[in-house]
Structure formats: C-alpha cells, structure tokens
Interface confidence: low
C-alpha cells in the first residue's frame, strides 16, 4: 500500500479543529502581479511582502507596489506603504535584509529618468520606520552588507563605480571606480576587480585583483591578469590568464592575497569554466569544465591550503558557465554530498559521497519501489535525484532537495528509481539516515517543508488545478494526514516557512481567480497544537550516524570521528522546540589509510586505499612553488584530509622544507603587487 | 550500426574553394561532437576542425583558420567542411569523425583532394 | 599548444612479440589520450581511450597506461592482422588536439 495508508499509521487526534484553530487568512488588496517575501531577522516573526504590478500603457509600463509587514509569522499583515510614501520598489534588487539579527532593510526605489541618482528607503528597527534617502549614484546591483559590521554597505553604479557607506546607507562615497566586481571578505575587508581598458568584458583576463582593508581609504592591488575571483572558506581564488595563450589558472591564497600559489589544477580553456561548489574553512570542492560543451566537468577535492587537489569524481554534470549543476551539500549529516554525473550514453545518474567526496556511490535503491523502465535490470538499479537540473530542463519537479543541519539525517528530494534520471512524473522520496537509505514518501510531484526540527513535514501537492488540502506527518515521512484548509481553493504558487526549520507555522501562498480580478491570498497555519507537549527526554533515541556495520569496531567513523546523537523517536508527537539544540556526542577513531589524501606527486589507483607515486615524478625531487618560495617535499604519499580528526592508527610522515629560493607563482608574484593610497 | 560517409572531394585549382560532406548514420547525431581530420599522400594525421554536439562551439588549428569552416545540420545528421583558398599542401585524404569527447571513436572511409593547377 | 613526441618512428617485430609504443607528451594532460591503428588504404580505428581503457571490440591484447606526461601502448602478443601504423592523440585542454607523427610497425 502507497505510504501513510498502512493500518499502523497512528492517528493524530482531532487534528482538525486544532488546525481550523490556528489557520489564519490574508487577502491582499492587490491585482495579481509579483510577490516577494522575506523574513526580517531570526525568531522574530517579523516578514515583509513586496507586491508589484505593472499596468502596461500604450507610451509606457505604470507600476505600483505595496509593502506589507506582519510579526506574528504571517498571520497577519498590515499594509505598510505609506512608510516608503508610496513609492514603486524595484524587484530586481529585492529587500537587502540585513545580516544576523539586525533588524535592517533597505528596499531600492524605481526612480524617474532624468534623476542624479538612485533611491533607497532604510530601516534599522525591523521595518517599524523607513528614512528615505537620495543617492549620489544609480545602482546596479543590490546594497551588499559587511558580514561583520551591518552600518558598512557596498553597491556597484551603473557606471561601475565601487560605493561605500559606513553608516548604513546615509553618506556614500565612490572609492573606486571602473569596478567590474566587488565582495566583502572577513575583517570589512572589500576585494574587487578592476579594468583598464574600456569595460569589464573587454578586459576580461586583463582584470586587475584590488583589495582594501579600511574601506577606501588604502589600496593594494594582488593580482594581475585575472579572470575571475572568488570567495569561500577561508580561501581566496583567482583564475589567471596564461602568458602564453588563452588558457587560465586557479591560484589561491589563504592571507587575503599577500601570498599566492597555483592550485594544482587543470588550466581551462575559452569556453570553459571553474567553478567553487562547496568551501569550508578546511576545504573546497572545485568543478573544473571539460573541453568543449560537453555538459560535465570534474570535481577536486583540495587539501587544507587549497592548493594539492584529489580527483573525486569524474563526468560531474554541469553545463554552463552560470549553469546547472545538481550538487547539494546534505546539511543533515557531516560529509554527504549529492550531484549528478552524465554517463558515456549521456543518461544522467546521481551519485551520493559520505565522506566529503573521497568516494562517490548512486543511491541505494529504496525498499518500498520497483525499477522503471530505464533499468536493464530489473532487480537492480538506483533512487535517482531530481535537483537545479531537472528543474531548469521543466521536469515536473517543483523543489530541489531538501535537508536541515538540525533535522539530523533526513533527506527529501524528488526521484525516480532506474538506471537513470528518468523524464517521467517523479515521486517524493526521504531518507532518515542522511541518505544511506531511502523510502518512496509521497506519490507525485510535490512541495515539501521542515517543521519544527524534523518533527513535522509538510507537503502541497505540485498540481495545476486550484488546491485547498495541505498534508503532514508527525513521524518522518511514514504516515500522512491531509487537513482542507480552505473551503475554496486557490491557484498554489509556493510554501514559505521561517528559515532554520525551528518554526511551527507554515504560509501557504496563491491566489484567487473570479471574473473580475485575481487576489494575493496567503494562509499560515501554526502546528503547536499537533505537537501538544514538549519532547522529554523518553521522546529521543541514541543513532549512531554513517553506521553500516554495527560488528565493525571503527563503524561510523568518517574524516576521524563518529557522532552519536540524541533523535527524536518516530513514535513520539511533541515539540522539539524554538530552542532545540542538537545533541551528538563525538568520538575519535584511529587513523587509516581513508583519513590521508594523496600528496602532491602521488596519485590512487582505483579501489585501492595506497598513494602510489606519479610515474613522471619517480626519482624526481619533489620542489612546488608555494608563496613565491621554492619548497621541498620529503613525503611517502599522504597528507591528512581537511577536517580529519583521527589520531594513533597509520601515521604517514610528511616534512616541506622551505628552499629559500624566490619562485614566481605565475603572474601573482608578492614582488608585481603594489599598495595605493587614496 | 555507426556510419560516416564523406563525399565532395575531387581536383581542384590553387585559390579554389570545395565542400565536404559527412552522412552520419547509425547514433543520435545531435548528442555527440564531430571533427574533421586529415592525412597527407605518405603522412601522418593532422586534427583539421572540431564543432560541438549542437553546432555552438567550433574549433580549428590556427594554421587553418579563417580559410576551413566546419558546420553540422543535425536535421540531416550530416557535418560540412567548407575549405576556402585551398593550397597545394591542403592535398589529403579528409576523414570525418565522431568525437564523443576523449576521443574520435568512429571515422568514415576518407575522401580525397587534390589541390593541384 | 601541446608536442606528442611518439617512438620509435618505426619498429619490426615478429609474431607473439610484445611491442611497446610510447607516446611523451609536453605537458600533463591528465590520462586524456587516446591510441589509433590504421592500415594501408584503410581509415583509422580507435584502439585506446582515456590513456587505458580499451574501445569497444578490441582484442585484450591491446592496452594502454601512463599518466602525467608519458603513455604506452602495448600489445602483448602481436598477431599478423596487427602489421600497421599506430598514432596517439591528446584531447587535454582546448584544441590543437595534436597527433603524434605516427609508429610504423613492420614485420621482420
């Protein structure tokens, strides 16, 4: 029997009346046209609701925006507009939410034609006041906030300039210009991309990499000939053109770009691409493109410099620059990751790592499934994940997979169960064990949430009919009861719940259709009432996570450590909380040969454990270029992984001896950098 | 059963133009890259062109640049070579090939220019 | 662009020798070689791809290795129908995709 019918399937009493309870309703006083929502800061309650409408004239397009505000988690709204007098909102640049708990917003104004410059309307008080104020420039991309301090703002112009307020968007001042790309790194620190020669397409290779440290005020520029650059981790990544051709480089660096060293990376071409998919402050995953336009590329794993990669899988489905691809870092246990690859018949199959890309596997096949057709075999084939890719090709997959670091272990994605990714309509499919094993949830396309830190689940079927029932499970995906929360249906456009999965309530967003006019309409139901007590500690159980052989007296060791933790029962209806912290007890495990990556110079045959030494370096004295010096490796292979916590066990030695030689790292040599000041 | 046929090769002057023909058949030709390759009387082989899957990157040795144009009509699962201002040492056996990626898995038989006055 | 350095130029061996043809190439290209036989009058054919994984329908005899800059072709019993010249290519970067200038093996 399909999921959640099964006889066991416990019941939730009176669900009903607690839910008719606690579902509240909002019409908006809006024509149909666009609707954006954002929440302002964690455990508030607060949201904010932008809805645009363009009316088309014959000359030009009217358009009008209103700004609503609610801070008991959308049940109610109040209409808000008259705060930003008024005012037509771009959508493009959306509402800047401030970082952390804040409580800033900016929204951009559309402004008339003739203007000196752009406007904005800034809150610092969680959107109870706006000040409006007239910009010095017109901007181009959304106001950036420093991760570290919510008064420091950075925004490109339309002439690409680089603009800095230090104090929330009040005072701007232009510290830069012909500015092609600009970040925030740690410390307010502010990296941006310079052209010389007309525009950034022009001089794109010929970039030059700046960066200041106080805000404008001093200059030094790291690196020539860039590309691109990028952020992750603790890492900083260029991608410089060669001397010689066309062909361009990753270099790296750890000190905010004093110090450079070439990533031990294929160059890449024209058309192709590199592209960061994951970074931590241990490690990056790279995807670097194949040749051509193949569709698919490779994934390195780097070490903890960043500098010495691991080829971890290869045929990695990616197809663009800008592109898809299917990777998703699996927030509910340490060390999944999920991507897809295209194999040689140009099928797409999805592989699943469990320790942080040393090995990649498909998916088992769930128990409760058959085969589809695209399975040779009947009897064996693999859960297949529908992710941005499926998505972008207008599969019917309304969402991409869904997990949260605190609903430990659970997974929820679309899929189809075969050989491959199959065309066909997709079912629901959840894994409670971070992807180890999966079950068939729900049948067909749907939308899907997390509530209450994996104590509840809920579902919207993906359907073009009007809608008025919304699903829920209490136990993980196994059993579900279906609640009508509106007499007349409405046109379903999306599931919007707090950011974290520790709220109870749910928004469910639409609109209404009658012959005269169409409706925003949201309703948000709050669970409280389903999940009548809190959890006690009889509610948890101890699960032991990456375990897949209970006789192994290393089970569940990945990257060094095993993790213990404390997970709510199945069986158990009750809150987790707004506070609930995950409980895990870790512990060390020895070292093997699966806790090293192989050096630089050293490679790993297919399934083996050993590094075996490059045959072009045999007999040949291991010398790298690493912050402009000439270093000297003594290794037999191994180097630990990122973010490997074994001890005792296999202990491979591994020395660099500094050569003190001057080496130049390409073309970010310390000696070709200079400092400004303004 | 892979098939590439090459037609269109024959004697032509010094400065003249001739197009090549490649008739895939056999594979999905639209998934699949195809490049051009070709071998001098007593030589060795020399990559001429390569285009990509649907048409949208196209590749040459900067020696042939400018003057060969490699295009593909996936609706007729055939691949051109369009060489211009043709040299004497443009004489050779040109072979069309399939090129999935790592390498050129399939090739037709050959067809022959003489670039001769 | 990258140079494929291919030896020996030319080589004559019995049948059921083994015979080793290696290909040095200027740069790492990462295992993205492929090996080609062709015979007289007759179009290429596709031995090895990916430095060592065989085509499909080639005999066992033929393999490939190597990785970094140096690969070899070997065949390790030679049978009369393996008399031809063999090529190998890199498909590493954006194009040229060199050939190597050919190994012609001849019977002694």
């Known amino acids: 029997s399909a999921p959640g019918e099964d006889e066991e399937c416990g019941r939730v009493r009176d669900f009903v009346a607690k839910l008719a309870n606690n579902t509240h309703q909002h019409v908006f006083d809006d024509l149909r046209g666009s609707v954006s929502l954002s929440w302002v800061g964690d455990s508030t309650g607060v949201i904010l609701v932008l809805t645009t409408f363009h009316v088309p004239l014959v000359i030009m397009t009217f358009g009008q925006s209103k700004l609503y505000r609610s801070e008991d988690y959308g049940k109610n709204f109040k209409d808000i507009t008259d705060l930003i007098n008024n005012t037509f909102i771009r959508t493009e640049f959306g509402m800047a939410i401030g970082p952390e708990n804040s409580g800033k917003v900016v929204l951009t104004a559309e402004v008339s034609g003739g203007s000196r410059g752009g406007r904005i309307f800034r809150s610092s008080d969680f959107a109870k006041n706006f000040v409006q104020t007239d910009l010095p420039f017109h901007p181009l991309t959304q106001m950036m906030y420093s991760p570290q301090n919510s008064d420091y703002l950075l925004a490109l112009s339309t002439e690409n300039g680089l603009w800095v307020s230090k104090n929330f968007g009040g005072k701007w001042e232009e510290i830069h210009k012909a500015v092609c790309l600009a970040k925030w790194g740690s410390d307010n620190t502010i990296f941006f991309t310079t052209y010389a020669n007309g525009s950034c397409k022009a001089d794109l290779g010929a970039l030059e990499l700046w960066r200041t440290s106080d805000l404008g005020k001093s200059f030094k520029t790291i690196g020539v000939k860039i590309y691109s650059f990028g952020l992750g981790g603790r890492f900083l990544f260029a991608s410089v053109m060669a001397d010689k051709d066309t062909t361009r480089r990753i270099h790296v660096s750890t000190d905010q770009g004093d110090t450079w060293s070439m990533a031990q990376l294929p160059s890449v071409g024209q058309e192709q691409f590199y592209s960061i998919l994951a970074a931590n402050d241990d490690m990056v995953f790279m995807h670097v493109d194949e040749p051509g336009d193949t569709g698919f590329g490779t994934i390195f794993t780097s070490d903890d410099r960043g500098i010495v990669y691991s080829k971890s899988l290869d045929r990695h489905l990616y197809t663009t620059t800008g592109g898809e691809t299917d990777f998703t870092n699996v927030t509910s246990l340490r060390g999944v990751y999920i991507t897809s690859v295209l194999s040689e018949d140009n099928s797409i199959q999805t592989m699943i790592t469990f320790d942080q890309g040393g090995r990649w596997t498909h998916l088992r096949k769930p128990e409760n499934s058959e085969c589809d057709a695209t399975a040779k075999n009947k009897n064996e084939c693999s859960l297949h994940i529908h992710a941005s890719y499926s998505i972008s090709q207008k599969l019917n997959v309304p969402m991409a997979p869904l997990s949260e670091p605190n609903a430990v272990g659970i997974v929820i994605a679309h899929g189809s169960v075969g050989d491959a990714i199959s065309v066909m309509v997709p079912d629901v499919y959840i894994s409670d064990d971070g992807g180890y094993s999966w079950t068939k949830m729900l049948e067909g396309p749907h939308y899907y949430t997390i509530l209450d830190s994996g104590g509840i689940i809920v579902a919207i079927e993906h359907s073009s009919r009007p809608i008025n029932v919304i699903k829920f499970s209490t136990d993980e995906g196994q059993c579900w009861q279906t609640y009508t929360f509106t007499r007349d249906p409405i046109y379903f456009t999306g599931l919007a719940s707090e950011p974290g999965a520790r709220s109870m309530n749910i928004s469910i967003w639409g609109f209404t259709e009658s012959f005269l006019t169409s409706q925003w309409v949201s309703y948000t139901i709050d669970f409280k009432d389903i999940l009548e007590r809190n959890c006690e500690e009889k509610d948890y159980t101890i699960w032991l996570a990456h375990s897949t052989d209970p006789e192994d007296y290393e089970d569940g060791c990945i990257l060094g450590y095993k993790e213990q933790f404390l997970r709510l029962r199945k069986s158990s209806v009750c809150q987790n909380g707004r506070d609930y912290v995950v409980t895990k007890q870790p512990s060390i495990c020895l070292c093997s040969l699966e806790d090293f990556l192989c050096d630089f110079g050293y490679y790993r045959p297919e399934n083996d454990s050993k590094c075996v030494e490059q045959p072009e370096l045999k007999g040949h004295d291991l010398e790298f270029c690493l912050y402009g010096r000439e270093e000297h490796l003594t290794t037999n292979g191994y180097r630990k992984i990122p973010g490997d916590k074994c001890q005792g066990g296999v202990n491979p030695v591994r020395e660099v001896k500094d050569l003190k030689k001057k080496c130049t790292s390409n073309f970010l040599s310390p000696e070709k950098q200079n400092s400004k000041s303004n | 059963e892979v098939q590439l046929v090459e037609s269109g090769g024959g004697l032509v002057q010094p400065g003249g133009s001739l197009r090549l023909s490649c008739a895939a058949s056999?594979?999905?030709?639209?998934?699949?890259?195809m490049s051009w390759v070709r071998q001098a009387p007593g030589k060795g082989l020399e990559w001429v062109a390569t285009?990509?899957?649907?048409?949208?990157?196209?590749y040459y040795p900067d020696i042939l640049k400018g003057r060969f144009t490699i295009s593909r009509d996936n609706a007729k699962n055939s691949l051109y070579l369009q060489m211009n201002s043709l040299r004497a040492e443009d004489t050779a056996v040109y072979y069309c090939?399939?090129?999935?990626?790592?390498?050129?898995?399939?090739w037709g038989q050959g067809t022959l220019v003489t670039v001769s006055s | 662009d990258i140079q494929m350095t291919q030896s020996p130029s030319s080589l004559s061996a019995s049948v059921g020798d083994r015979v080793t043809i290696t290909c040095r190439v200027s740069?790492?290209?990462?295992?993205?070689l492929a090996w080609y036989q062709q015979k007289p009058g007759k179009s290429p054919k596709l031995l090895v791809y990916?430095?060592?994984n065989g085509a499909d329908g080639v005999p066992s005899r033929f393999s490939g290795s190597g990785s970094g800059t140096d690969y070899t072709l070997t065949i390790s019993s030679l049978q009369p129908e393996d008399f031809a010249t063999y090529y190998c290519?890199?498909?590493?970067?954006?194009?040229?995709?060199?050939f190597g200038q050919g190994t012609k093996l001849e019977i002694k």
């Open positions: 990916a430095a060592t």
């Open positions: 090939a399939r090129h999935p990626g790592g390498a050129m898995d399939y």
């Open positions: 740069e790492n290209i990462y295992s993205n």
């Open positions: 056999g594979f999905t030709f639209n998934i699949y890259g």
């Open positions: 290519q890199h498909f590493w970067g954006t194009p040229p995709w060199t």
């Open positions: 285009i990509s899957s649907g048409g949208i990157y196209t």
